[in-house]
Interface confidence: medium
């Protein structure tokens, strides 16, 4: 199919464009170009007859068009009016016509833009500034750049007038930046020179430095004032309301107590017309004053807050000292002193950090102490404790539960039964309970200051029958002659008798056996291997009784001194040596052998075939119990004689 391609499609004024013909048919008579989307004799640009190779200009010919034998049309020195459609009319030898249309667009080469502003010296927080990108150009796109970045998103920035105008509402000092605009169309892009926005601001509240306000007689007072301001501020100093001088710094040498008073720095901005002042009170001491402690946090929360205690006043060239609980500061990673020792910071306070804290100022003769300061550390609540610890009750008794959780300020308590709120008290009392009062009893402790809550849940069972008890142990694998074991009969029940049996017998009398906690706990001191028995606890009341399953105590012991068998120590040459080692131990020990000090194998049995006199020597068996951490050994001497030299020798194994 006959097609026209415009190269380029977007053409700059003054440049040229080629209307390139694709798929031109064979056997042509000629062709003709027209301006527009159809064949119109009045708008013919040029015609071409192939046979004569003759090009004939038409009414629309401008003298800038060149036609090529392949039917392509070059238009030079493009003007704005050239924009639009172009139609090629092809006449074949058989006089059948074919048409194709192409198009291009003409854009001007853009000039370098510039920025105009409606306000060259806007005042912060008061004025708006409108930047306009010049000139106004048709079919151009306008872009803005701030510090060579695209525009940030801000409700104070507004584009209007087809993005040609950038308005900054309520300018701030942060709007002081380099602004550029850019114009773009399909054939060119140009960027303006920078415009620097000069925002007038301030003065802010001046800062007087240094910050210390306490001085000793004889020192020099050198105060400096600074206020952020554009243009820079003009400064004036007043002492006790009386004007002193118009300088940024105030210097008074060799001050006396009479120089105490209020020192005011006034900053003035002549462009904004604004004044700001800051006052500092200077105290000149004849001698060091009594120090006092200030805190940045009067109610710190445990494990969350840090507290900075500062020793006041700040005095140059002074040594500051600190005491906690009437002792000098302990070494702790949570205690930090500032470089001048004036500020003591407690990182992540705990309830133990309450103090008291004292600071001191050292002078030539003595140390002046501050009054003690106590921290009010907010903590908790910790996990509440519900008492008594009974979990089983008989019907008909009164249930009285008390809840307590360490907390500052004291916790507020709530009780829930099976998830339902009951009352907001520390104690819960239910008279004449029945089985229906069985359930989950939750105490909730809340600290109103920290906003933290903690809960403890207790299962209460009301039943005439006692449950089957169970035994808990504080040590499942005690070591002989070293550990004690405490067995506790669970659960704890009210008005209940606790009983114990060992191997089905009642408890033997022994100074190593001790009952406590209302016979609920049985303690075995210095356990021995003979204590490895079956222990049963029982509970009983006037209605029922029940026994636990037996718990067998697994006592770790040994290894005892090993025994090597057979006991023979003399062997004939040629016999087999088969030594076995055994040691009483729980768990079973690990065995190893050494012959004449040289390690052999890690087995219980040592076997050597056809021994000779070379096998004479010391045979040592070593035993170790990894669980008890204990070791033991025994040494046996073996003598091997040449065959037949001495009667009565063993023939070996």
């Amino acid at each position: 199919k006959l097609t026209i391609e415009s190269t380029p499609f977007n053409v700059a004024e003054g440049k040229e464009v080629l209307l390139l013909v694709h798929n031109l048919p064979q056997h042509l008579f000629g062709y003709s170009w027209y301006k527009g989307e159809r064949v119109d004799g009045n708008r013919q640009i040029i015609g071409y007859v192939i046979g004569t190779q003759q090009a004939t200009p038409g009414p629309a010919y401008s003298g800038r068009e060149i036609i090529y034998p392949n039917a392509s049309l070059l238009i030079q020195n493009i003007i704005q009016n050239d924009t639009g459609f172009y139609t090629l009319h092809v006449i074949k030898s058989d006089l059948v016509n074919e048409e194709a249309t192409g198009q291009f667009r003409v854009y001007p080469e853009l000039p370098k833009p510039s920025i105009s502003s409606n306000n060259s010296k806007p005042v912060e927080d008061k004025d708006a500034v409108a930047f306009t990108c010049e000139p106004e150009t048709q079919d151009a796109t306008y872009l803005w750049w701030v510090n060579n970045q695209s525009l940030p998103v801000s409700p104070r920035l507004q584009l209007s007038n087809g993005n040609r105008t950038l308005t900054l509402f309520n300018v701030t000092r942060n709007d002081t930046a380099s602004y550029k605009c850019e114009t773009q169309n399909p054939v060119s892009a140009r960027r303006s020179d920078s415009v620097i926005l000069n925002v007038l601001y301030g003065p802010d509240a001046p800062t007087i430095s240094p910050l210390n306000t306490s001085y000793r007689s004889g020192e020099n007072l050198n105060l400096s004032c600074h206020a952020a301001s554009n243009p820079p501020a003009q400064y004036s100093w007043f002492v006790n309301g009386t004007f002193q001088q118009s300088t940024q710094e105030l210097f008074i040498p060799n001050i006396t107590v009479n120089n105490s008073g209020s020192y005011t720095c006034q900053a003035h901005n002549s462009d904004t017309g604004l004044n700001r002042t800051t006052v500092t009170t200077i105290t000149v001491y004849a001698e060091p004053p009594k120090p006092f402690i200030t805190s940045n946090n009067s109610n710190p929360v445990e494990d969350e807050d840090a507290v900075a205690l500062t020793c006041e006043p700040e005095i140059q060239n002074t040594t500051y000292l600190w005491w906690v609980n009437n002792q000098s500061l302990p070494v702790s990673p949570r205690l930090q002193l500032s470089n001048d020792n004036r500020t003591l910071t407690l990182l992540s306070v705990t309830r133990n950090d309450v103090g008291p804290y004292e600071c001191g100022i050292q002078n030539e003769l003595s140390v002046d102490h501050s009054d003690p300061v106590i921290l009010n550390v907010l903590y908790g609540p910790d996990d509440p404790t519900i008492s008594p610890s009974y979990t089983y009750y008989r019907p008909g008794v009164n249930l009285s539960l008390s809840c307590h959780a360490a907390s500052n300020p004291p916790a507020q308590y709530s009780w829930l039964i099976d998830g339902n709120i009951q009352q907001h008290t520390q104690e819960l009392f239910i008279s004449n309970i029945t089985e229906k009062n069985s359930g989950l009893y939750t105490c909730q402790a809340n600290n109103s200051a920290s906003g933290h809550s903690r809960t403890t849940v207790k299962t209460i069972t009301v039943s005439a029958e006692l449950p089957k008890p169970s035994i808990s142990s504080n040590n499942s694998k005690p070591v002989e002659d070293k550990d004690a074991v405490a067995f506790t009969c669970e659960p704890e029940a009210q008005n209940t008798t606790y009983l114990w049996w060992v191997n089905g017998q009642s408890l033997p009398v022994s100074p190593r056996l001790q009952l406590s906690n209302g016979n609920r706990t049985l303690t075995l001191f210095n356990v021995t291997r003979n204590d490895a028995r079956a222990y049963v606890c029982g509970i009983q009341n006037s209605v029922s009784a029940n026994r636990s399953d037996p718990v067998t105590l697994d006592v770790l012991y040994g290894p005892d001194t090993p025994i090597i068998s057979p006991p023979d120590s003399s062997y004939l040459s040629g016999a087999n040596l088969n030594l076995s080692c055994h040691s009483a131990s729980n768990p079973s020990p690990q065995y190893s052998w050494r012959i004449n000090g040289i390690p052999q194998q890690h087995t219980q049995v040592l076997f050597i075939a056809k021994i000779t006199p070379n096998n004479n020597g010391t045979y040592a068996c070593f035993v170790s119990n990894l669980a008890t951490g204990r070791n033991n050994s025994i040494v046996k001497s073996i003598t091997v004689s040449a065959s037949g030299t001495s009667p009565g020798l063993s023939a070996g194994a």
Epitope: D418, G419, K436, G439, L440, S463
Partner: antibody, heavy 124, light 110 residues
Framework: QVQLQESGPGLVRPSQTLSLTCTAS????????MHWVRQPPGRGLEWIGW????????EYAPKFQGRVTMLVDTSKNTFSLRLSSVTAADTAVYYC?????????????????WGQGSLVTVSS | DIQMTQSPSSLSASVGDRVTITCRAS??????????MHWYQQTPGKAPKLLIY???NLQSGVPSRFSGSGSGTDYTFTISSLQPEDIATYYC????????FGQGTKLQIT
């Protein structure tokens, strides 16, 4: 012998109130929390609520709140369920039950005694 | 509400097989040493029957091939050797707060 038996109409019209009664025998209902559980056809079990016959205290599942009422008649050792504004979705087998008559246990919501169930169909 | 997720929703096994059903709670149903999870068996047309209470305790009269275990949020119900009479739907139920049941597991014999 400990038993629970549900009774009531098997057919209820939409928007009407479903009423069922559970009669206990072999024990005194005042000593236990009494519950209702239902099971729509081919579906799982849904707990409706409990009543404490001793004082009339009740607690209902949030799903049924506002539509359900449980009442007790300790003189007859019975308790009842009323479910208002019923729709076809309330068609189910309704069971009364209670906890821990045969087992010493430690929570009120635990069911080892059940009625045989009563099928209630909601249809016009 | 604590949500119960029971799996699988159905399963087939042969006589003598070991069968395991699990139930997961959306938050812990354990408190003060107890796990408030119970298991029921329901055969067609009958009321549910309590098998296991407080996670692992066998209800009186229930065969010892049924067992339960678990704590916190995850619980398991096991039939050690499946018998023909065990064809039923099994439900878990918690009683840590207002009770809710699992959606059930339908057990069939292949």
């Amino acid at each position: 012998q400990v038993q629970l038996q549900e009774s009531g109409p098997g057919l209820v019209r939409p928007s009407q109130t479903l009423s069922l009664t559970c009669t206990a025998s072999g024990f005194n209902i005042k000593d236990y929390y009494m519950h209702w559980v239902r099971q729509p056809p081919g579906r799982g079990l849904e707990w409706i609520g409990w009543i404490d016959p001793e004082n009339g205290d009740t607690e209902y599942a949030p799903k049924f709140q506002g539509r359900v009422t449980m009442l007790v008649d300790t003189s007859k050792n019975t308790f009842s369920l009323r479910l208002s504004s019923v729709t076809a979705a309330d068609t189910a087998v309704y069971y009364c039950n209670t906890r821990g008559l045969s087992t010493m246990i430690t929570t009120r919501w635990f069911f080892d005694v059940w009625g045989q169930g009563s099928l209630v169909t909601v249809s016009s | 509400d604590i949500q119960m997720t029971q799996s699988p929703s159905s399963l087939s096994a042969s006589v003598g097989d070991r069968v395991t059903i699990t139930c997961r709670a959306s938050k812990s149903v354990s408190a003060s040493g107890y796990s408030y999870m119970h298991w029921y068996q329901q055969t067609p047309g009958k009321a549910p029957k309590l098998l296991i209470y407080l996670a692992s305790n066998l209800q009186s009269g229930v065969p010892s091939r049924f067992s339960g275990s678990g704590s916190g949020t995850d619980y398991t119900f096991t039939i050690s050797s499946l018998q023909p009479e065990d064809i039923a739907t099994y439900y878990c139920q918690h009683s840590r707060e207002l009770p809710t049941f699992g959606q059930g597991t339908k057990l069939q014999i292949t």
